[in-house]
């Protein structure tokens, strides 16, 4: 089936926005005013995955770029990366597992759990201007809660 997608931005629970940091990395920092235009717009696609009544499988692409967040092992550690794909073939309903995140809504906040690595989440640091990463702990120092803002196409 044609994949359903929406455009959105994400902010962590400390209100930090996500921006590009080099060609293949995202970082989180507080933005205000005109600087808000720097934040990345995601194309969130609703894909096949191990869907449950409270987990919705999604893929997170960067709008109008052929880049998707993906989860891979690097030096034996689950790692978040931006991966380049063939724009002719993506997005698709049947994404490879490394591209899939379980979107979990709890108390109006969103978590994004890696489908490839259960209990690992898209995370940001408390500190400013640090990379967005895949974290294996919830409720600790690192931030795993996000809010989503819809962006018109």
């Amino acid at each position: 089936a044609p994949v359903r997608s929406l455009n959105c931005t994400l902010r962590d629970s400390q209100q930090k926005s996500l921006v590009m940091s080099g060609p293949y990395e995202l970082k989180a920092l507080h933005l205000q005013g005109q600087d808000m235009e720097q934040q990345v717009v995601f194309s969130m696609s609703f894909v096949q995955g191990e869907e449950s009544n409270d987990k919705i499988p999604v893929a997170l692409g960067l709008k109008e770029k052929n880049l998707y967040l993906s989860c891979v092992l690097k030096d034996d550690k689950p790692t978040l990366q931006l991966e380049s794909v063939d724009p002719k073939n993506y997005p698709k309903k049947k994404m490879e597992k490394r591209f899939v995140f379980n979107k979990i809504e709890i108390n109006n906040k969103l978590e994004f759990e890696s489908a490839q690595f259960p209990n690992w989440y898209i995370s940001t640091s408390q500190a400013e201007n640090m990379p967005v990463f895949l974290g294996g702990t919830k409720g600790g120092q690192d931030i795993t809660d996000f809010t989503m803002q819809f962006v018109s196409s």
């Epitope: 089936a1 191990e50 449950s52 009544n53 899939v100």
Partner: antibody
């Protein structure tokens, strides 16, 4: 060889509950999802819900409040608990293995058990 | 939820006949349609999985076609053992949904 064997069916009083078991072999429950499906006498097939390899569950909305699917990986067994039974829950209950092929066919079901008959009657 | 409308609900045919069953879905499901055969007192048996793929060991007289919302299942030359009930199942999205079934009877 993949096999699924249901058990636990029988006569249940209206308002009662049932707990069915599905013992599997030939595959590991931590890797594959398992669905429950039922078929009322002379009727079609109705999908009830599933449990994924990681333990997450999805229930079909009309029955969500009355169903619990669980599993014990070490016993290679999946369970279906259903509460507040009524006459229209009388059916053969099947479990089936999900294909769980990422990027290809995640939701299709390939192997089915023989089924167990549940009769709800006073 | 994707609803699946299967027709006909019953069908009388003779050995050697060509038989066609249709399933129409309420949403575009790409090629994610599956076809099952069920005989009395037995569980459904998967004949054709999504992508119109014939399962290993299933005779080549069984075939299917279609994508999007319109799907067809064909038995090219009916054999005595083919008299059974046939179901389609969409596996594009949850909840999984079946067609109402087609009972194939001897004329």
């Amino acid at each position: 060889e993949v096999q699924l064997v249901e058990s636990g069916g029988g006569l249940v009083q209206p308002g009662g509950s049932l707990r069915l078991s599905c013992a599997v072999s030939g595959f590991t429950l931590s890797d594959y999802g398992v669905s429950w499906i039922r078929q009322a006498p002379g009727k079609g097939l109705e999908w009830l819900g599933l449990i994924w390899g990681g333990g997450d569950t999805y229930y079909n909305s009309p029955l969500k409040s009355r169903l619990t699917i669980s599993k014990d990986n070490s016993k290679s067994t999946v369970y279906l608990q259903m509460n507040s039974l009524r006459a229209e829950d009388t059916a053969v209950y099947y479990c089936a293995k999900q294909r769980t092929l990422w990027g290809y066919d995640l939701y299709g079901m390939d192997y089915w058990g023989q089924g167990t008959l549940v009769t709800v009657s006073s | 939820e994707t609803t699946v409308t299967q027709s006909p609900s019953s069908l009388s045919a003779s050995v050697g006949d060509r038989v066609t069953i249709t399933c129409i879905t309420s949403t575009d499901i790409d090629v994610d349609m599956n076809w099952y055969q069920q005989k009395p007192g037995k569980p459904p048996k998967l004949l054709i999985s999504q992508g119109n793929t014939l399962r290993p060991g299933v005779p080549s007289r069984f075939s299917s076609s279609g994508s999007g919302t319109d799907f067809t299942f064909t038995i090219s030359s009916l054999q005595p053992e083919d008299f059974a009930t046939y179901y389609c199942l969409q596996s594009d999205n949850l909840p999984l949904t079946f067609g109402q079934g087609t009972k194939l009877e001897i004329k």
